[in-house]
């Protein structure tokens, strides 16, 4: 390590008046003052890597990446980025510190990522490595699409006041249920704004930016289709568009549909129908009932009725704020060490939540499912067995949601042992929480039979990452016992383990693991 | 040059509420991300880590101090503050803030710069 | 929380002489393991990170080992300026740890 060179790696960030073009520079601009970011070397590597601490910057800052070098004689570089070589020019300071700069002007997605800088100097070669990425700023947003008739034309188009300006695109599928999961070959996508085929089975519309993506159904009511046990159930904020369409299939054109909120036909200019015949000659009729902008007086069951068909209804709830409903209490699972066992959590929300599971402070991909009766359900199943604190975070622009679990694994206990000068303790994490016993081993008791009660202190404690409880014993020791070997013994419903300890010995000193079943 | 420099009282009284601030000077917690930790030292005996800020405001505290302590950070100001309820005369120690680097890689050096500390004594 | 257990809690010892310490975790902690440097009324000082790899610009003469429960840090030959306290420091789980210390006193 003696001939590696002492590195600084700081940022600038630079007012955003400049007019400095290039990417790679030796002279940076006038700018705030540089801020070390605790550049050091790489553990467990292969080569000497430097990382500097990860750089967050917002959308359209003007940064330069600097690294000082302390070493003798010259250094020669490359910047790479994306693999791409980027050009670069070392020079030197007063201090006759090597100086690498890298400018970024207008930081923009593309220019995020991983810069790696490396230098060769006349002892050593080494690698700095940089990761930039913008900050989330309110800049950039993703909203949920929405539905507006297309002047004088039957057709739909799809709206979603995102930034940056977001593709958007229908997706359309024609089968029934499960087949109209998104990767499935009945699905289309077609990247445009404006829709014309507006009789099929199921369509969505969706956003999507560096944000991520948003989508919006077509809420459906098909006068063909067995009515669902529970009234299906529309929630939109005041202020929102409401759209449902009805659709009814017959075998010719005689018939008619109709859309009544609360037994009193909907106001022209609230409605518009489309018919069209299908391939078997068959006639499909769709009845769209759309408000620009709900309010308060928009609720109640819109009930669309033909006279070929029996009526269905949906109950449009309007709110004034979005909601997450479901049970926030605790909930604590034990299970077997090869159990399957998921977490599941059920609630209704709008708009549309977003969602994590969280352990030891790592997040994994939340993915919800629609059940029938207008509630959703998330759940998680990648614990990996791993007791401790689960939780689940829910989110939409309205309402957030916490729910804690608690996992406990079936275990037997292993024992861990240590003694002090004082002390001799014992830890275990077996679950259920072990009990303890101390034994003697002498020449009367070989076989450390003769238990200890004197001087036994036991607890449980919290291991604050995981959640988890561990069980510790601790012997104090006394004039009797010291010199002696001591056994410490964990047992639950699923076991014991013990630990053999000599009680003169000043470090930890676990002289041998005894596993007994 | 990178300095963390703590300011507090030096004397507190005991129930007191004792609040320290940690300024920091050569990094900032907008652009770089960096965590702070609390540590303290009472006279002649060992280091006791107290609570740690991360850079998304994540925080973590002592098991035996976690009903007292409160860390918070003010990104504009470039600040860190500590406080700890209920003082008493075992909490007199000398209270240090040091910085740890968050790499995107994930491994961690724990803290590389220090203050020089701040001396608090609590008595009545 | 998890135990730091550091040997011995104090030496003596002359210029030259080759010093080591020693840490104990009650679990396994991987490499999350520091070594800092103290001297009376200054601050701690970060000699060895990630268990084994010296802190930039600190003498070579210090080196660290060790991953999971046992760790050990070396001053293949100790100077005057070596004088001081040492501690470990696992951060690993929270609450994060230090050990109690060692002294390394003038023989």
């Known amino acids: 390590n003696q001939d590696l060179p002492v590195i600084k790696c700081v940022l600038i960030n630079h007012k955003n008046n400049d007019s400095s073009v290039g990417k790679s520079s030796s002279y940076p601009m006038v700018s705030e003052s540089p801020e070390d970011l605790g550049c050091a070397l790489r553990p467990q590597s292969s080569g000497t890597v430097y990382e500097a601490a990860a750089v967050e910057v917002d959308v359209s800052a003007s940064i330069t990446l600097q690294v000082l070098v302390d070493a003798p004689g010259n250094i020669s570089c490359l910047w790479v980025f994306k693999h791409s070589s980027l050009n670069c020019q070392p020079h030197f300071d007063l201090q006759n510190r090597g100086v690498v700069s890298m400018v970024i002007l207008k930081m923009t997605e593309t220019q995020a990522g991983e810069y790696l800088l490396f230098i060769q100097s006349e002892a050593t070669n080494y690698t700095i490595l940089f990761t930039v990425s913008i900050r989330n700023t309110l800049l950039y947003t993703l909203r949920r699409p929405y539905f507006r008739k297309m002047e004088n034309q039957d057709a739909l188009v799809c709206i979603s006041e995102s930034v940056p300006e977001p593709i958007v695109e229908w997706v359309l599928c024609d089968s029934q249920g499960e087949s109209c999961k998104e990767e499935s070959p009945a699905v289309v996508k077609k990247e445009e704004k404006v829709l014309h085929e507006l009789f099929g089975t199921d369509i969505r519309c969706c956003a999507r930016n560096e944000l991520g993506r948003e989508c919006t159904r077509l809420f459906t009511i098909d006068l063909n289709q067995t009515p669902q046990t529970t009234l299906p159930q529309l929630f939109l904020k005041v202020g929102e568009p409401l759209w449902i369409r009805c659709k009814a299939v017959h075998v010719n054109h005689g018939f008619g549909l109709t859309w009544e909120l609360e037994n009193k036909a909907l106001e022209e200019g609230n409605y518009f129908e489309m018919s069209t015949y299908s391939t078997n000659r068959t006639m499909i009729r769709i009845l769209f009932a759309f408000v620009s902008s709900v309010a308060r007086n928009d609720t109640g069951y819109y009930t669309c009725s033909s006279s070929k068909h029996p009526s269905q209804s949906a109950l449009v709830t309007i709110v004034e704020k979005g909601f997450i409903n479901a049970t926030n209490s605790s909930e604590d699972y034990e299970i077997d060490q090869y159990e399957e066992f998921c977490f599941s959590v059920r609630f209704k929300a709008y708009p549309q939540i977003r969602c994590t599971w969280t352990f030891s402070r790592k997040s994994f991909p939340c993915e919800q499912k629609g059940l029938d009766n207008g509630y959703s359900i998330s759940k998680f199943c990648n614990h990996k067995h791993q007791p401790g604190e689960y939780i689940f975070h829910a989110e939409n622009d309205d309402a957030q949601f916490t729910k804690m679990f608690t996992l406990n694994i079936r275990r037997k206990p292993q024992v861990l042992a240590e003694a002090s000068a004082s002390q001799a303790s014992c830890f275990s994490d077996g679950y259920p929480l072990p009990s303890w016993t101390w034994k003697k081993c002498s020449d009367k008791s070989p076989n450390c039979t003769e238990e200890i009660t004197e001087g036994v202190w036991n607890r449980k404690a919290n291991r604050k990452v995981f959640g988890q409880w561990v069980s510790s014993s601790t012997l104090n020791m006394s004039e009797a016992i010291k010199g002696f070997l001591v056994k410490c013994c964990a047992y639950n419903s699923l076991g014991t383990s013990c630990e053999t300890i000599l009680l003169n010995s000043p470090g930890p000193f676990p002289f041998i693991q005894d596993n007994i079943s | 040059q990178v300095t963390l420099k703590e300011s507090g009282p030096a004397l507190v009284k005991p129930t007191e509420t004792l609040t320290l601030t940690c300024t920091v000077s050569?990094?900032?917690?907008?652009?770089?991300?960096?965590?702070v930790s609390w540590i303290r030292q009472p006279p002649g005996k060992a280091l006791e880590w107290l609570a740690h800020?991360?850079?998304?405001?994540?925080?973590s505290y002592s098991t035996s101090l976690k009903s007292r302590l409160t860390i918070s950070k003010d990104t504009s100001k470039s600040q860190v503050v500590l406080t700890l309820t209920n003082m008493d005369p075992v909490d007199t120690a000398t209270y240090f803030c040091?910085?740890?680097?968050?790499?995107?890689?994930?491994?961690?050096?724990?803290?590389?710069?220090w203050g020089q500390g701040t001396m608090v004594t609590v008595s009545s | 929380d998890i135990q730091m257990t550091q040997s011995p809690s104090s030496l003596s010892a002359s210029v030259g002489d080759r010093v080591t310490i020693t840490c104990r975790a009650s679990?396994?902690?991987?490499?999350?393991l520091g070594w800092y440097q103290q001297k009376p009324g200054k601050a701690p000082k970060r000699l060895i990170y990630?268990?084994?790899t010296l802190q930039s610009g600190v003498p070579s003469r210090f080196s660290g080992s060790g991953s999971g429960t046992e760790f050990t840090l070396i001053i293949s030959s100790l100077q005057p300026e070596d004088f001081a306290t040492y501690y470990c420091?696992?951060?690993?789980?929270?609450?994060?740890?230090f050990g109690q210390g060692t002294k390394v006193e003038i023989k």
């Open positions: 800020i991360f850079s998304n405001d994540e925080k």
């Open positions: 679990q396994d902690i991987g490499y999350d």
């Open positions: 040091a910085r740890m680097p968050e790499y995107s890689s994930g491994w961690s050096g724990a803290f590389d710069i």
């Open positions: 420091l696992q951060h690993n789980s929270f609450p994060w740890t």
């Open positions: 050569g990094f900032s917690f907008r652009n770089a991300r960096m965590g």
């Open positions: 990630a268990a084994s």
